[in-house]
């Protein structure tokens, strides 16, 4: 009985296709590969950004596999052939690794790169994106973000900066059509006649940078002698009702000072016969069954009630 | 339907040099692995260079290696063969083929020609 | 280098026939064998590739065969738009390789 060997898959590469962190891992087939034609053989892949201590194991049928990386790291992958037992009349058959790397060179010394990067989706509909120029580059440096998410043919650069003296500092991005709930790739590099610039990667999902509107329509109503019931509006625009989750501040004659979290647009309050003066804000925030992230909206306006008999009216702001 | 379209053939004199191009369409490009054949006057088939769907790999057989470089740029749909120190021997038809998931060749474009001679 | 060798450079059928053409590699090649079918004029057309798979769109008049080093391909009930040179290659080991080519001529 000769031994049943495989080879590990030919030509096997980590490709750029200009998607500024999306890659793809391709490779061939082994040689001979077609003596296990009634057979269906398996590659094992793995892959990481260099520095992780954890690989990315997947086990496919194909000859290509596509992921986000961090393109501020090297990328490293290795994979091998595995034929299943039904093959082999026997155990598992594993060919040896093939191995690749891929990483960008980079340009510049990292100080050169932009500092304190912050991107934030504006009430789900408008993406900002603000930086820093990188440590003691000179004005003459200027800096261009390149964005892409899939459904763009390819990487777009920004058509609408933010400027201070000259300098590219931001951008104000289009309307992006069907882009959340999956990665958006950013690239920020730069030129200046002096000096090389490093370029800077940076990947999110715009869910998870949302900062809603605060919410509208502050009314307070009586419903028993003790109790009284905040009630708001969502804020206008496209995130719905259930994404919302809300904080409430209360100060009640300007000393209580009540805190709430809540998952809807009303809060009942106890109160006493006493209370002369009831004021309240809130904010909103991007839920977890909408997003794993998000950024608190400003306060609302503040909504007060002073007087004796609030049975007789629903106060509107 | 895929298509490769090779341009670039002309007269050049020993020792001279020519980039060839091929224009692909109808297949995603960087998946496949492109080589360049040629065919010689006397109608024999040499294999001249292939290069893997990235680009991370190259091949040639030693009757070019050193002279002839293979590129690919697949923003562009486009695989070039630079030649240089050209003898009267590289007269040929080259073609421009896509390797399919072995190394044999299963689109072929029409072909450019090259003469070297003086 | 490995070199394939096709030693009928011209054969000659007649439409209906059947026939074999043969192709022999210098050293084991395993099953990494590839035909090809080039019509005057125009550029060569892969028909078989691993010794004994067609291309979709090859009619199956085409069948491809052997393996290590004796390699066939044979064309049954040979059509006049079969008159062409057939070539095949090996893809075992580079530098890739062809044959010198078998040209079949229709009676």
């Known amino acids: 009985d000769t031994e049943i060997k495989v080879n590990p898959p030919q030509d096997f590469e980590i490709v750029d296709p200009g998607y500024l962190g999306y890659l793809y891992l391709q490779w061939q087939p082994p040689l001979s590969l077609d003596h296990f034609k009634e057979c269906t053989v398996e590659y094992e892949l793995k892959y990481r950004n260099i520095g992780s201590e954890t690989w990315k194991t997947i086990i496919t049928k194909n000859l290509h596999y596509k992921d986000g990386f961090d393109l501020n790291k090297g990328i490293e992958a290795k994979i091998h052939t595995l034929l299943p037992w039904q093959c082999t009349n026997g155990s598992e058959v594993q060919s040896s690794w093939a191995e690749t790397t891929y990483w960008i060179s980079p340009q510049g010394i990292p100080e050169t790169k932009v500092q304190d990067m912050d991107c934030v989706y504006y009430n789900w509909q408008y993406l900002l994106c603000s930086w820093k120029p990188g440590i003691g580059v000179l004005l003459d440096t200027n800096y261009n973000l390149f964005y892409w998410y899939e459904g763009l043919d390819h990487a777009l650069q920004c058509v609408d900066y933010i400027k201070a003296d000259g300098q590219n500092i931001g951008c104000r991005f289009p309307y992006l059509e069907a882009s959340d709930y999956k990665d958006f790739y950013i690239c920020v590099n730069g030129s200046s006649e002096n000096k090389p610039i490093r370029s800077s990667y940076f990947t999110f999902q715009l869910q998870n940078i949302v900062k809603p509107l605060p919410p509208v329509y502050l009314t307070f109503t009586r419903e028993s002698s003790c109790e009284i019931k905040l009630k708001w509006s969502i804020p206008l625009g496209p995130i719905p009702a259930r994404c919302f989750d809300y904080e409430i501040e209360i100060r009640e004659d300007d000393t209580t000072l009540v805190t709430a979290t809540v998952e809807n647009e009303t809060y009942t309050l106890k109160t006493t016969n006493e209370t002369r003066q009831l004021c309240f804000v809130v904010r909103s925030k991007v839920n977890i069954y909408c997003s794993d992230d998000g950024i608190w909206s400003e306060w609302s306006d503040k909504q007060c009630w002073e007087g004796e008999d609030l049975s007789k009216k629903t106060l509107l702001r | 339907e895929v298509k490769l379209v090779e341009s670039g053939g002309g007269l050049v004199k020993p020792g001279g040099s020519l980039k060839l191009s091929c224009a692909a369409s109808?297949?995603?490009?960087?998946?496949?692995?492109m080589s360049w054949v040629r065919q010689t006057p006397e109608k024999r088939l040499e294999w001249v260079a292939t290069?893997?769907?990235?680009?991370?790999?190259?091949y040639y057989p030693d009757s070019v290696k050193g002279r002839f470089t293979i590129s690919r740029d697949n923003a562009k749909n486009n695989l070039y063969l630079q030649m240089s120190s050209l003898r009267s021997e590289d007269t040929a038809l080259y073609y421009c083929a896509r390797r399919d998931l072995r190394s044999a060749m299963d689109y072929w474009g029409q072909g450019t020609s090259v003469t070297v001679s003086s | 280098d490995i070199v394939m060798t096709q030693s009928q450079k011209f054969m000659s059928t007649s439409v209906g026939d059947r026939v074999s053409v043969t192709c022999k590699a210098s050293q084991n090649v395993d099953i990494n064998v590839a035909w090809y079918q080039q019509k005057p004029g125009q550029s060569p057309k892969a028909l078989i590739y691993?010794?004994?798979y067609r291309y979709s769109g090859v009619p199956d008049r085409f069948t491809g065969s052997g393996s290590g080093t004796d390699f066939t391909l044979t064309i049954s009930n040979v059509q006049s738009e079969d008159l062409a040179e057939f070539f095949c290659q090996q893809y075992n080991n580079y530098p890739l390789t062809f044959g010198g080519g078998t040209k079949l001529e229709i009676k």
């Open positions: 109808g297949f995603t490009f960087s998946s496949y692995g």
């Open positions: 290069i893997s769907g990235g680009g991370s790999y190259t």
């Open positions: 691993s010794a004994s």
